[in-house]
């Protein structure tokens, strides 16, 4: 008795984070024995789509010509071979940006900070939101979440960093969102460059832009300070 068919691989091109209106292609790669591919979307009737394999039959293409809210979500794919259906692929989370207005990201008291001191990144949205995300470019784990606990909505979230070290330096953006869909994000904020200068205690020079994928501030959990606990926002690392 042969074992279960190996699960296919699922991915998106040009990536899994897509701006509203842009095109995206979802690929499902199985085996050369595949006769049909099926794509399922969580919380949608199954199958979400079916495609015949492309030669040499080991993969199928699912095209989204223009990204909209209804395409954002969690997908899995399967393939059918002469012996039956495969195991499901690992999930693909397709995220749409541009669902909400562009937030503003600023650094308090300044984006120029001395090592050992404190800085707070402030993400402000135009309309009340319940989730704020801080992203550091080229970080291994780029997401920092502040999420409202009771659906309470606010116009801003604070991301305190203390004490600041050279690894905090780099380029940050923030997004805002509503908890009803983790797959819908705002437009990205303009980038904010956080520049960490040395001090007497820490004379090492700090790059003005983080170029490594080594640990960044998101790998050093910090308790929210200031107004954040009172605003009902809770921190999550992903």
């Amino acid at each position: 008795q042969a074992g279960p068919l190996p699960k296919p691989t699922l991915w998106a091109e040009p990536g899994s984070v897509i701006s509203w209106g842009n095109s995206v292609t979802i690929w499902c790669q199985g085996t050369l024995e595949a006769r049909e591919y099926r794509l399922d979307k969580e919380e949608s009737p199954a199958p979400w789509d079916r495609q015949n394999p492309l030669e040499p039959k080991n993969k199928a293409r699912f095209s989204i010509p223009s990204m909209t809210e209804d395409y954002a979500g969690r997908y899995r794919c399967y393939y059918r071979s002469p012996v039956g259906w495969s195991q499901p692929s690992d999930p693909l989370e397709l995220v749409m940006t541009g669902a909400y207005s562009k937030p503003t990201l600023s650094a308090l008291p300044s984006p120029l900070v001395t090592s050992g001191k404190s800085v707070t990144l402030l993400c402000q949205s135009r309309s009340p939101m319940d989730t704020f995300l801080l992203i550091k470019e080229r970080a291994a784990h780029p997401l920092l979440h502040l999420r409202s606990e009771h659906g309470a909505q606010q116009h801003q979230a604070e991301f305190p960093m203390s004490p600041v070290t050279s690894v905090h330096g780099g380029t940050y953006r923030c997004f805002s969102s509503h908890g009803f869909s983790h797959y819908l994000l705002s437009h990205p904020s303009d980038p904010l460059e956080l520049i960490v200068s040395g001090s007497l205690e820490d004379p090492r020079p700090s790059p003005t832009r983080s170029v490594s994928t080594a640990a960044g501030p998101e790998d050093q959990p910090l308790m929210p300070t200031g107004s954040v606990p009172h605003s009902g926002l809770r921190r999550h690392w992903e």
């Epitope: 909209t68 541009g98 207005s101 562009k102 437009h187």
Partner: antibody
């Protein structure tokens, strides 16, 4: 205070063109998605078109697709609507508006200009 | 397109509660959010956003305005009605493209 001032309306013959402008002030124009909404006595309020803050994406209602072009100049703080091949059914007051986002779920209109009248008639 | 139906007019006395309804031809809910929005338009003026996402009060709008409902049936409540509230009220949906408006309800004095 947010201010949106439309201009460029008037009387135009069917098949001809017209360009509306909207001068924005009192907010960071380059951060806001924008839209045009029109209002005709016979058809009520109708969303016409939207554009992202950077001009990178646009959206149109089916009846104006291929005839109208929305654009913006962030340096000037101005939104535009180029209207070609105009029809009598395009007769309406056209409003310039800020929009939460170009995405359908967020196409609600938080600030409105005073509107400009476009009459398409021979 | 999603069609939003509003009754053309509602007569109300000053100081009383006004309830303006809006019915959608299909659900305008997305998860726990209801994608309906309310506007006020006075004669000769542009519309003004009152309520977004069914129940969130827009900036600068007095608390006597409130919104409720889910799925296909929504209500804008004004309590108490003041003379300045005499206007036409429109609902709008953003669940499906294109965004569409109701025909408007004219609020009149009894």
């Amino acid at each position: 205070e947010v201010q949106l001032v439309e201009s460029g309306g008037g009387l135009v013959q069917p098949g001809r063109s017209m360009k509306l402008s909207c001068a924005a002030s009192g907010f960071t124009f380059s951060n806001f998605d924008m839209a045009w909404v029109r209002q005709a006595p016979t058809r009520g309020l109708e969303w016409v078109s939207s554009i992202t803050y950077d001009g990178g994406s646009t959206s149109y209602r089916d009846s104006v697709k291929g005839r109208f072009t929305i654009s913006r100049d962030n340096a000037k703080g101005t939104l535009y609507l180029q209207m070609d091949s105009l029809r009598s059914e395009d007769t309406a007051t056209y409003y310039c508006t800020t929009v939460e986002s170009i995405a359908t779920i967020s196409t609600y209109f938080d600030y409105w200009g005073q509107g400009v009248m476009v009459t398409v008639s021979s | 397109d999603i069609v939003l139906t509003q009754s053309p007019a509602l007569a109300v006395s000053l100081g009383q509660r006004a309830t303006i309804s809006c019915r959608a031809s299909q659900s305008v809910s997305m998860s726990r959010y209801d994608l309906i929005h309310w506007y006020q338009q006075k004669p000769g003026q542009q519309p003004k956003l009152l309520i977004f996402r069914a129940s969130d009060l827009a900036s600068g709008i007095p608390a006597r305005f409130s919104g409720s409902g889910s799925g296909t049936d929504f209500t804008l409540t004004i309590n108490p009605v003041q003379a300045d509230d005499i206007a036409t009220y429109y609902c709008q949906q953003t669940r499906k493209s294109p965004p569409t408006f109701g025909g408007g309800t004219r609020l009149e004095l009894k």
